[in-house]
């Protein structure tokens, strides 16, 4: 017998469905209605036929009582080709739910998203994560999606984007967004970062993650942040091949005084890069290629410095910097 596509745990907390049949029995997902955390993977199926079965224009208020009874707080939908109209229909219905975190991964969104009707209510998400989602509408996708969300979004993560730059003039501000993660967009680069960080649309950002995004120098990132008026408290530039030296012709960039934590681990650095902020609470330089202990004048004023996993560090040697958090044990880098 073929295994059931969905599995609900004994606590009714987590439910995972993997639909791999060409014509899946979607009713199997019903058992997930009592779960808090739901994952549905559609095996790469085209969900276009669903449009014939559902009335995407129906008033979602007719489902309000049922949807309010759902316990789902975290929903992941993956591996499907989804008509924009169907996505919108789902968002309209889910607006009546208690859903807080939505993850979309490995999706191809086809067609354009209609505008939000006047009487419609947006989805009150706190977290939206997108990974490898392509949109037929190109650069305007974020603005189109944003209109279906209430303005309280706190966490936005966009990985493996086909169009990581946004149509900034169409995007409204994200007043509550404190964490923006653009990691795993290796083609982004510093110019792309400037295009993605729409000026003054992200006024509340505290945490900015740019792992594996094709960044080249901390100074270049500083310039992009300054241009956008983004002042994070914490910045993650790990897993980028960073150059330690700054282009002499490039203007010097003043880091925001708000920045207190900088992650430069796994960045291939052979020396401490120039142009770092003058003062930091946390600086992570672990798993680089530093062949000697950094001199005090090369480093910012820093409370917690991590240098683990660099070649110069042999277990048992003296800690290279006051206030360091090094364990003396070389981690797996």
């Amino acid at each position: 017998t073929t295994p059931e596509p969905c599995e609900l745990d004994d606590e009714d907390f987590r439910c995972v469905c993997n639909f791999s049949e060409p014509q899946p029995d979607w009713s199997e997902a019903f058992q997930c209605v009592s779960a808090v955390e739901v994952e549905i993977h559609a095996g790469g199926l085209n969900l276009e036929p669903f449009l014939k079965r559902v009335d995407a224009d129906a008033d979602p208020r007719q489902y309000a009582d049922t949807v309010k009874a759902l316990r789902v707080r975290r929903l992941t939908v993956g591996a499907a080709q989804v008509p924009a109209q169907l996505l919108v229909g789902a968002l309209r219905v889910l607006a009546y739910s208690r859903l807080k975190e939505l993850t979309l991964e490995d999706l191809k969104i086809t067609g354009t998203m209609p505008p939000l009707p006047l009487e419609a209510t947006g989805l009150a998400l706190s977290s939206l994560r997108l990974r490898n989602v392509s949109w037929a509408t190109g650069r305007s996708w974020l603005a189109e999606l944003q209109q279906w969300l209430k303005p309280g979004l706190k966490v936005l993560s966009i990985a493996q984007a086909h169009s990581p730059a946004f149509s900034c003039e169409q995007v409204r501000a994200f007043p509550a967004l404190t964490s923006l993660d653009l990691s795993d967009n290796p083609g982004l680069g510093e110019r792309g970062l400037m295009a993605a960080l729409c000026p003054h649309k992200f006024p509340a950002i505290q945490n900015l993650a740019l792992r594996n995004t094709g960044m080249e120098t901390p100074t270049g990132v500083c310039a992009a942040l300054a241009a956008a008026g983004v002042q994070p408290h914490s910045l993650d530039l790990s897993h980028n091949s960073l150059r330690a030296t700054v282009n002499p012709s490039a203007p010097r960039c003043m880091w925001s005084s708000a920045l207190n934590s900088l992650n430069l681990s796994f960045a291939g650095l052979e020396q401490v890069p120039k142009g770092l902020p003058a003062k930091l609470r946390v600086l992570d330089l672990s798993c680089n290629r530093l062949n000697r202990a950094p001199q005090p004048d090369e480093l910012p004023e820093v409370d917690n410095l991590t240098l683990d996993g660099n070649p110069f560090l042999v277990p048992g040697t003296a800690l290279p910097h006051e206030g360091s958090m090094n364990s003396g044990v070389v981690p797996a880098c």
Epitope: D10, E11, D12, Q31, T66
Partner: nanobody, 115 residues
Framework: QVQLQESGGGLVQAGGSLRLSCAAS????????MGWYRQPPGKEREMVAQ???????NYGDSVKGRFTISRGNARNTVYLQMNNLKPEDTAVYYC?????????WGQGTQVTVSS
């Protein structure tokens, strides 16, 4: 191991009613989603009705408005009230309990609707 026992099937005239019952016994530590499925002669098994642990229901298109699924007071008992029965409702009706690791199915009860 969980056992499911269906009852209430039988022969009924078109337009008539039947009430199926299903009782679950064995190692069940929480209220689980349950459902009724049917297999008409020579056809695939299909979903008839489902009920979640919190009482949310779902019905197959062909039975909407005629069949009602409900839970009993006992922890994992489920009923299927079938009204306005049609000859095409003739099938073996199975009860199902959604359970982590391996779902449990009953042996089935025959429902025959004569015209």
């Amino acid at each position: 191991q969980v056992q499911l026992q269906e009852s209430g099937g039988g022969l009924v005239q078109a337009g008539g009613s039947l009430r199926l019952s299903c009782a679950a016994s064995g190692r069940i530590f929480s209220i689980r989603p349950m459902g009724w499925y049917r297999q008409p002669p020579g056809k695939e098994r299909e979903m008839v009705a489902q009920i979640s642990s919190s009482g949310i229901t779902n019905y197959g298109d062909s039975v909407k408005g005629r069949f009602t699924i409900s839970r009993g007071n006992a922890r994992n008992t489920v009923y299927l009230q079938m009204n306005n029965l049609k000859p095409e409702d003739t099938a073996v009706y199975y009860c199902r309990l959604f359970k982590t690791g391996a779902d449990s199915w009953g042996q089935g009860t025959q429902v025959t609707v004569s015209s």
